[in-house]
């Protein structure tokens, strides 16, 4: 059918609550394109009728709510004037929420479910709620170890829980809960977050500092090999992960089939008060689809990107 297949990460979700996934693949979806969602290679598209429990809402697929039997591989087909991309998303549904039982619960945690607070400082947790505009989210309630959070050290601000003067006792299992309204119906969304505590050392505060890249573009010829380093300084006792992502997916997972773009092995140099980490990204062969796409270096809560750009034509050659 001429569509290029792109395999996205697995999404691990809780049953009996709403879930949405947006089909975006810049720069493809930034132009005039049509997006159609399918389940398990079915020829019949997902319904666009808003009363349907599972339906397409603009570029999103929306589950109201997600159910145990909804696990599977979903495809969104992005058709442009001269291109076609088929993005595969593997959704795995788990039935139970941790506060109800430990049985059949989340068996492993993606980065979105893990957050860090910094000892002795004012810090915050974020409730990741990604839904289309048709979904209205009410105020967020926060829970720690299955009891609602109360107390003057905690303040709810939009999707964040502000925690003042973080203590060691603040580690644990948190959940954020919101009521989502869609077409007059209300649904509960509950996201689990496991929180660890880290100390800030003297060097440069607790937030890792990305020295390079600096959110900029790199001119590179089509077909060439390119290696870009991400250089990060961080405290010696940090627990932060450093990685390259594209479309919020680890590059090694995103390019799992072709292995054309890979993350390198991390190295570090130890200084008296901090470490300097380097992790590179290698483009074995730069292709047209790489241009305009932000390749993100992540280091804990810090991010920085590069965007590949075709060199401007050199008119002196003519």
């Amino acid at each position: 059918d001429g569509c290029k297949d792109i395999f996205m990460k697995n999404e691990i979700l809780s049953a009996s609550q709403p879930f949405a996934f947006n089909c975006t693949f810049p720069p493809i979806t930034s132009g005039e394109v049509s997006v159609t969602w399918y389940k398990n290679s079915s020829k019949i598209p997902v319904s666009k009728i808003i009363q349907s429990r599972i339906h397409q809402d603009e570029t999103w697929i929306l589950f109201l709510p997600m159910e145990w039997g909804d696990s599977g591989v979903y495809q969104c087909v992005i058709k442009g004037r001269d291109s076609c991309h088929r993005i595969h998303v593997n959704l795995t549904v788990f039935e139970k929420h941790w506060c109800d039982t430990s049985i059949g619960g989340l068996p492993n945690l993606s980065d979105e479910y893990k957050q860090i607070l910094h000892l002795g400082k004012d810090d915050s947790l974020t409730c990741h709620l990604h839904f289309p505009k048709s979904c209205v989210l009410g105020p967020i309630k926060w829970y720690k170890d299955c009891n609602e959070i109360k107390g003057e050290r905690f303040t709810v601000l939009e999707t964040r829980l502000l925690v003042s003067n973080v203590s060691a006792e603040d580690r644990g299992n948190y959940a954020c809960q919101a009521i989502l309204t869609h077409s007059g119906k209300q649904y509960e969304v509950l996201n689990g977050i496991t929180v660890s505590i880290t100390e800030r050392a003297g060097y440069g505060g607790s937030v890792p500092k990305i020295i390079y890249p600096k959110n900029h573009s790199i001119e590179v010829q089509l077909g060439t090999t390119l290696i870009v380093d991400c250089n990060v300084t961080d405290t010696k006792d940090n627990t932060n992960l450093r990685c390259w992502r594209v479309n919020n997916t680890l590059v090694d997972d995103y390019y799992d089939e072709s292995k054309r773009i890979r993350e390198g092995v991390e190295t570090h140099v130890s200084f008296r008060e901090h470490n300097l980490y380097t992790v590179n990204i290698t483009f074995l062969e730069v292709k047209m689809e790489d241009y305009g796409l932000p390749f993100m270096c992540h280091a804990g809560v810090s991010t920085a990107y590069i965007i590949l750009q075709l060199p401007a034509p050199d008119f002196r050659a003519y």
């Epitope: 059949g104 619960g105 299955c146 006792e169 496991t194």
Partner: antibody, heavy 119, light 108 residues
Framework: QVQLVQSGAEVKKPGASVKVSCKAS????????MHWAKQAPGQGLEWIGE????????NYNQKFQGRVTMTRDTSISTAYMELSRLRSDDTAVYYC????????????WGQGTLVTVSS | EIVLTQSPGTLSLSPGERATLSCSAS???????LHWYQQKPGQAPRLWIY???NRATGIPDRFSGSGSGTDFTLTISRLEPEDFATYYC?????????FGQGTKLEIK
């Protein structure tokens, strides 16, 4: 390091009740579910139920429902399992075991408590 | 409930030999939720392999786990004297949690 220390052996008469304790240390007691399992002499393991120490929510194996009560005292980081209307086939070693968020398996076990039911 | 059946009940082998322990589930179990424990007489069980194929901390690499759906296997490539014990498989997918009846690995 993480430790689950259980109370000592008990001898009970049929029809009586027994309450076994499990004292946790080395981690945040209120963050993990505590489970209980039974192992009769020379037999395999049987799951009894679980309790969340912070919310006190419990889930029991239907086989033990009505005879088992799980409680906790967060001030001393201790979980309890009480079994009532004891019968001779309740003679067993009882274990507590802990389950962490995102890790649905028993990584830590108590040393076990032998309960003997005999007239 | 999910019934786990282990085979054989007893396995008699000599040190240096390869051991294969099987665990069969009455209905499909996600690989994330199938675990193995080792137990020696008078001791509490100890987590040995979690999520089908991951060795717990300190478990030697002669132990490996595999399988999916309803059939799971624990393999010991070369038996050492300290490996002789009873091994239980267990599922954490649905309530009630269940264990296999155990495979006793004894010295021949």
């Amino acid at each position: 390091q993480v430790q689950l220390v259980q109370s000592g052996a008990e001898v009970k008469k049929p029809g009586a009740s027994v309450k076994v304790s499990c004292k946790a240390s080395g981690y945040t007691f209120t963050s993990s579910w505590m489970h209980w399992a039974k192992q009769a002499p020379g037999q395999g393991l049987e799951w009894i139920g679980e309790i969340h120490p912070n919310s006190a929510k419990t889930n029991y194996n239907q086989k033990f429902q009505g005879r088992v009560t799980m409680t906790r005292d967060t001030s001393i980081s201790t979980a309890y399992m009480e079994l009532s209307r004891l019968r001779s086939d309740d003679t067993a070693v009882y274990y507590c075991a802990r389950v962490d968020y995102g890790k649905p398996w028993f990584a830590y076990w108590g040393q076990g408590t032998l309960v003997t039911v005999s007239s | 409930e999910i019934v786990l059946t282990q085979s054989p009940g007893t396995l008699s082998l000599s040190p240096g030999e390869r051991a294969t322990l099987s665990c069969s589930a009455s209905s499909s179990v996600s690989s994330s939720y199938l675990h193995w424990y080792q137990q020696k007489p008078g001791q509490a069980p100890r987590l040995w392999i979690y999520s089908t194929s991951n060795r717990a901390t300190g478990i030697p690499d002669r132990f490996s786990g595999s399988g999916s759906g309803t059939d799971f296997t624990l393999t010991i490539s070369r038996l050492e004297p300290e490996d002789f014990a009873t091994y239980y498989c267990q599922q954490f997918q649905s309530s009630p949690l269940t264990f296999g009846q155990g495979t006793k690995l004894e010295i021949k």
